[in-house]
């Protein structure tokens, strides 16, 4: 469930603190409820960037697990089509810490509406 997703995000946050990853990531910091799935897709795609840049097994595994969890949760809700949402590349670029904080916020949005 989404609680496990948050715990994976916290784990990623802890793991990257011990590394120097200065990437900036497309971050949706003000998610509109009607675009939350699109925003989630962008967060997950950017997580893969963190995984790739870190070259770390623990981060890789945790990112992969998080994507598997999110996929399964969202697929159980059926196909959700959203329109008029920002493309990932249109989002503001932020550092990893801010990116992960915003990611936690969107997950909490899913928790609150489930």
């Amino acid at each position: 469930n989404w609680v496990n997703v948050i715990s994976d995000l916290k784990k990623i946050e802890d793991l990257i603190q011990s590394m120097h990853i200065d990437a900036t990531l497309y971050t949706e910091s003000d998610v509109h409820p009607s675009c939350k799935v699109t925003a989630m897709k962008c967060f997950l795609l950017e997580l893969q960037v963190i995984s790739h840049e870190s070259g770390d097994t623990d981060i890789h595994d945790t990112v992969e697990n998080l994507i598997i969890l999110a996929n399964n949760i969202l697929s159980s809700n059926g196909n959700i089509t959203e329109s008029g949402c920002k493309e990932c590349e249109e989002l503001e670029e932020k550092n990893i810490k801010e990116f992960l904080q915003s990611f936690v916020h969107i997950v909490q949005m899913f928790i609150n509406t489930s």
Epitope: T57, I68, N72
Partner: antibody, heavy 122, light 112 residues
Framework: EVRLMASGGGLVQPGGSLRLSCAAS????????MSWVRQAPGKGLEWVAT????????YYPDSVKGRFTISRDNSKNTLYLQMNSLRAEDTAVYYC???????????????WGQGTLVTVSS | DVVMTQSPLSLPVTLGQPASISCRSS???????????LEWYQQRPGQSPRLLIY???NRFSGVPDRFSGSGSGTDFTLKISRVEAEDVGVYYC?????????FGQGTKLEIK
């Protein structure tokens, strides 16, 4: 050439336990997730379990969840499948397979071992 | 769970002729990141399965170019442009987009 050698199969009574092993060589074992897939006699393939590269994350179908445990020892380049509370329907050839992970270009089981036969019968 | 349904289950083909196997999923297997983890495996008689195609249309290394994969959403196809004797066996589609990962029932290709 990537090599995967499954072993540990045999005859076991219903309710019994068995541990399968899969010895990996000719590749960096810790860089790959791994899976077990089984095939009942004359039947199709069924995914049984997957484990992440570091071993922290495991995935199972409901048919084996709570009875089977996938694990790995990266220092020994070995994958395991602990099977408890075995049933007649668990009778199958069990294959281990290397799993290419998504972040390196897509999920797929790119190399398979030769399989080991597990027979559950009284 | 995603159910994968293959057709036909048996496919007699003349050597040198094309062959086509269909695989349909019970729901879209496009994941949240836009990827479709649909694979095709070949199992020759008495052998372990072998990866042919991954992510719908990507041929695995060493797989002859007479094998091709296509499709999207819920409908997928494996095509063999000209069947050779070594192609005899059972072909399985497999989705790895959602847990539990699931195989199709298999299609047995035989020479007429």
């Amino acid at each position: 050439e990537v090599r995967l050698m499954a072993s540990g199969g045999g005859l076991v009574q219903p309710g019994g336990s068995l541990r399968l092993s899969c010895a990996a060589s000719e590749f960096t074992f810790s860089n790959y997730a791994m899976s077990w897939v089984r095939q009942a006699p004359g039947k199709g393939l069924e995914w049984v379990a997957t484990i992440s590269r570091g071993g922290d994350y495991t995935y199972y179908p409901d048919s084996v969840k709570g009875r089977f445990t996938i694990s790995r020892d990266n220092s020994k380049n070995t994958l395991y499948l602990q099977m408890n509370s075995l049933r007649a329907e668990d009778t199958a050839v069990y294959y281990c397979a290397r799993r290419v992970s998504m972040i390196t270009g897509g999920w797929a089981m790119d190399y398979w071992g030769q399989g080991t036969l597990v027979t559950v019968s009284s | 769970d995603v159910v994968m349904t293959q057709s036909p289950l048996s496919l007699p083909v003349t050597l040198g002729q094309p062959a086509s196997i269909s695989c349909r999923s019970s729901q879209s297997i496009v994941d949240i990141t836009g990827n479709t983890y649909l694979e095709w495996y070949q199992q020759r008689p008495g052998q372990s399965p072998r990866l042919l195609i991954y992510k719908v249309f990507n041929r695995f290394s060493g797989v002859p170019d007479r094998f091709s994969g296509s499709g999207s959403g819920t409908d997928f196809t494996l095509k063999i442009s000209r069947v050779e004797a070594e192609d005899v066996g059972v072909y399985y589609c497999f989705q790895e987009s959602f847990v539990p990962y699931t195989f199709g029932q298999g299609t047995k290709l035989e020479i007429k």
